[in-house]
């Protein structure tokens, strides 16, 4: 099941995830001047089996001067420029990306992307957390957030980061070792009677992706 | 026939605030992704914000982050656009669009266009 929402906003910090789950769907979105093809796929969704995990669907881009026909209401306006992104879900090689059972690598770059990816997380991710550039960790606890199943609903663990304005940055796990927190979780990790599983969780992703992936939001 | 019908603009001065609507009509309000973009005068028309289908997520462009917020209500099948503080520089034609993907910024993942509602920004 997607999370319904998106990983907590730590002030002056940025996330990113150093694998992804089987689930994890990516929008293949394309560059200024260019667009999906046609019946092309709208996403690449991490899949696999108990022993290899990979990237099913392939995102292809082609020239928007090259379509003939449109959908639209009003014609469709010039591409927009190109614009950095301030997100961590944007196309970058984690430092240490174990292989981890389950999960997938970073997708490798598709021609002609667009600048920032946009994936769509499943329960059970984990994702990590840095100060940006000029902010460095005051206290830290676990910098990292995971999405959970809590009676039903989806919700992120809270980071315990804290960035100040001073001109040292914080590394990812693998470049340097987080300090053990002394309060450890911030909220308490109560069970529920229902519960849904990894293995409930794909088994209903691969049942409903084919027929609803046009039009229901894993959400 | 589809159709993406904007209202609510208008004239405000700066510092200002204005919700826009976009109403869905001619199909199921089944789009996963709907966004607001917008155009001003000699401009290239830019993303400004896009929602999920459930609205739990949002994307915004930084140039209206903590002042603009997005909104659906898919019992009236309708998008929203609250726009708080408003500047000069926001003074711009407003687009609802609607896509396939969940949460697009990206202008070519938009099938679909509305009409556009004029929004100015001047004291």
């Known amino acids: 099941e997607l999370c319904d929402d998106d990983p907590p906003e730590i002030p002056h910090a940025t996330f990113k995830a150093m694998a992804y789950k089987e689930g994890t769907m990516l929008n293949c979105e394309c560059k200024r001047g260019f667009r999906r093809i046609k019946s092309g796929s709208l996403y690449m969704l991490c899949t696999g089996n108990s022993s290899h995990s990979s990237w099913d669907n392939q995102c292809q881009c082609t020239s928007s001067a090259t379509r003939n026909t449109t959908k639209q209401v009003t014609p469709q306006p010039e591409e927009q420029k190109e614009r950095k992104t301030t997100e961590m879900q944007s196309p970058m090689q984690p430092v240490d990306q174990a292989s981890l059972p389950g999960h997938c690598r970073e997708p490798p770059p598709w021609e002609n992307e667009a600048t920032e990816r946009i994936y769509h997380f499943v329960v059970g991710q984990m994702v990590y957390y840095q100060c940006v550039q000029g902010y460095r960790a005051l206290h830290r606890g676990p910098a990292e957030s995971v999405c959970k199943m809590t009676h039903g609903k989806t919700r992120w663990t809270q980071p315990q980061l804290i960035c100040t304005g001073e001109m040292e940055t914080s590394q990812f796990p693998g470049e340097e070792k987080p300090q053990a927190s002394p309060e450890g979780r911030p909220e308490s990790e109560t069970s529920c009677l229902v519960t849904t599983t990894d293995f409930q969780i794909q088994t209903e992703m691969a049942a409903t992706m084919e027929t609803s992936i046009f039009t229901t939001e894993y959400q | 026939e589809v159709q993406l019908l904007e209202s609510g603009g208008g004239l405000v001065q700066p510092g200002g605030s204005l919700r826009v609507s976009c109403a869905a009509s001619?199909?199921?309000?089944?789009?996963?992704?709907m966004g607001w973009f917008r155009q001003a005068p000699g401009k290239e028309r830019e993303f400004v914000a896009a929602i999920s289908q459930s609205g739990g997520r949002t994307r915004y462009a930084d140039s209206v982050k903590g002042r603009f917020t997005i909104s659906r209500d898919n019992a009236k099948n309708t998008v929203y656009l609250q726009m708080n503080s408003l500047r000069p520089e926001d003074t711009a034609v407003y687009y609802c669009?609607?896509?396939?993907?969940?949460?697009?910024?990206?202008?070519?993942?938009?099938?679909?266009w509305g009409q556009g509602t004029q929004v100015t920004v001047s004291s």
């Open positions: 001619g199909r199921t309000f089944s789009w996963n992704g």
């Open positions: 669009a609607a896509s396939d993907f969940l949460l697009a910024t990206t202008i070519s993942a938009y099938d679909y």
